[in-house]
């Protein structure tokens, strides 16, 4: 074992090139200078090293940079990035969007790994906030990125960044995440006119309160059923039959197909059957005529 630690005569690497793929692990360890490797990291990606050989190269970099790699090295890690652990990445200080893009490219096509999640977190925290350029980049690689942020983290996204969000970026967000994003979207799009505003705000409406839905119902927006079904149940329940009819416009007929599903089912139970009948859709389950409706939420508030 002791003999193997010395580099054999004539095998000392002068540069990082294809000849190194024929080196055994111990030869790589003994014959490749870590500083040389660091300055020529961009070449590693073009050489078909085995996983075992990549382990050796990573080990050399770890020894050279025990406190974490400099960005000049990180940017050129290429496939070596896949060898990094979240613990390694927590030591990094990544500030360049180009570095982030280079590393995300390596992981392209795969779901977000703990390594990538940590890298993104380090990058965003280093910048201080999730700005538009970063959000553009992240959602391009991971359309579900925004929904992988907790409501706590989403709450720090500046409203200006909301312009970068596409409807598909919100597909996997839950109601609590939309609760946080909706007021930001409302702020971001506040200067748009009615129809343009609705197009932009539509994907965020899962976080809209009752009063905003009531306001939209006065604007001839013709909300589709898919959007209506994603609204908060507690926001839909107080809407009158007339308001829902105005909100959905020609799409109101779709209520029949959804009458057994939330929020439609719960909304029907809160409406007078007489009012439901005015829609002419055969919706059943409303409050029969002559029954007194107690507003339990008001009663609870008073007690």
């Amino acid at each position: 074992e002791v003999e193997k630690t010395a580099c054999p005569s004539g095998k000392k690497a002068r540069e990082i090139d294809e000849s190194l793929i024929f080196y055994k692990k111990w030869e790589l360890e003994a014959c490749v200078d870590a500083a040389l490797l660091a300055t020529q990291m961009d070449r590693v990606n073009a050489i078909p090293f085995t996983y075992e050989q990549l382990d050796v190269l990573k080990h050399k970099l770890d020894e050279l940079y025990p406190q974490g790699y400099p960005e000049s090295v990180i940017q050129h890690l290429g496939y070596l990035f896949l060898k990094m652990s979240p613990e390694d990445i927590r030591k990094w200080n990544v500030t360049s969007l180009e570095t982030l893009k280079a590393l995300l490219e390596v992981n392209k096509g795969h779901e977000m790994s703990p390594q990538v999640a940590t890298l993104i977190d380090r990058f965003v925290k280093g910048r201080g906030q999730l700005d538009k350029d970063t959000l553009d980049t992240l959602t391009a690689f991971y359309p579900g990125y925004l929904c992988s942020l907790s409501p706590e983290e989403l709450s720090s996204v500046p409203p200006s960044s909301i312009w970068a969000v596409r409807p598909q970026d919100l597909d996997t967000c839950d109601p609590r995440q939309l609760d946080v994003l909706y007021p930001k979207a409302r702020l971001a799009f506040q200067n748009m006119n009615g129809s343009e505003y609705f197009v932009k705000i539509q994907s965020f409406l899962g976080g809209a309160p009752t009063e905003d839905l009531k306001a939209l119902s006065q604007q001839n927006v013709s909300m589709d059923l898919a959007t209506f079904m994603k609204l908060r149940t507690d926001a839909v329940l107080p809407l009158t039959v007339a308001e829902v009819q105005k909100l959905l416009g020609p799409h109101v007929e779709g209520l029949k197909a959804e009458e057994r599903h939330r929020p439609v089912r719960d909304w029907i139970l809160r409406q007078r059957q007489d009012d439901l009948d005015t829609l002419g859709l055969g919706l059943q389950g409303g409050i029969p005529n002559g029954y007194l409706v107690l507003d339990l939420s008001m009663q609870e508030a008073l007690s």
Epitope: A117, K125, G144, S150, E153, C173
Partner: antibody, heavy 118, light 112 residues
Framework: EVMLVESGGDLVKPGGSLKLSCAAS????????MSWVRRTPEKRLEWVAT????????FYPDSVKGRFTISRDNAKNTLYLQMNSLRSEDTAMYYC???????????WGAGTTVTVSS | DVVMTQTPLSLPVSLGDQASISCRSS???????????LHWYLQKPGQSPKLLIY???NRFSGVPDRFSGSGSGTDFTLKISRVEAEDLGIYFC????????TFGGATKLELK
């Protein structure tokens, strides 16, 4: 070294108030959401409050909503918890904790004891 | 609220034993984004809780590989392959998929 140090715990009567503080060091405080979590005498952990990194949003469970207020001063690297209308069931060890990138509490302080008793 | 139920409440072991703690949630912990936010914490005597495992099976920084997490949906398990003295303490599972964030009722790992 990343550190969180709580202070302000005390014995207080039911209905009383108390303000806890948490001094953070060793990391960029202003980049992280922060939380308070408590451990009850029955050894249960309960999440109490969270505030986002810039202090513009707060989150609470129903059990403390309206009574407790979480706040922060990023210039002083300090997190606070103002507790009003205290009840005996608020008796616990209160921990300050950092909210991490995978929706977990990754750094905890040593805790400060709050006892609500007449 | 999502109720997290841990079993057993107490787990007497000998050093070197394998230990297994179960955690069951009252509803699925799979978030609509595909992730499962189920974590495990250890609180040693006289110390604050420390994160061990995040998102079901990922070991946190510095956690020995004798700790492993598994499970899906509503049923999860923490295993310690060979218990060491420093592993003794109270274990908590926790979910952050749903609001409010909730913790399991605690399992005390102690010597027989």
């Amino acid at each position: 070294e990343v550190m969180l140090v709580e202070s302000g715990g005390d014995l207080v009567k039911p209905g009383g108030s108390l303000k806890l503080s948490c001094a953070a060091s060793g990391f960029t405080f202003s980049s992280y959401a922060m939380s308070w979590v408590r451990r009850t005498p029955e050894k249960r952990l309960e999440w109490v409050a969270t505030i986002n990194s810039d202090g513009s949003y707060t989150f609470y469970p129903d059990s403390v909503k309206g009574r407790f207020t979480i706040s922060r001063d990023n210039a002083k690297n300090t997190l606070y918890l103002q507790m009003n209308s205290l009840r005996s069931e608020d008796t616990a060890m209160y921990y300050c904790a950092r909210w991490g990138e995978n929706w977990y509490f990754d750094v905890w302080g040593a805790g400060t004891t709050v006892t609500v008793s007449s | 609220d999502v109720v997290m139920t841990q079993t057993p409440l107490s787990l007497p072991v000998s050093l070197g034993d394998q230990a297994s703690i179960s955690c069951r949630s009252s509803q699925s912990l799979v978030h609509s984004n595909g992730n499962t936010y189920l974590h495990w914490y250890l609180q040693k005597p006289g110390q604050s809780p420390k994160l061990l495992i995040y998102k079901v099976s990922n070991r946190f920084s510095g956690v020995p590989d004798r700790f492993s997490g598994s499970g899906s949906g509503t049923d999860f398990t923490l295993k310690i392959s060979r218990v060491e003295a420093e592993d003794l303490g109270i274990y908590f599972c926790s979910q952050s998929t749903h609001f409010p964030r909730t913790f399991g009722g605690a399992t005390k790992l102690e010597l027989k």
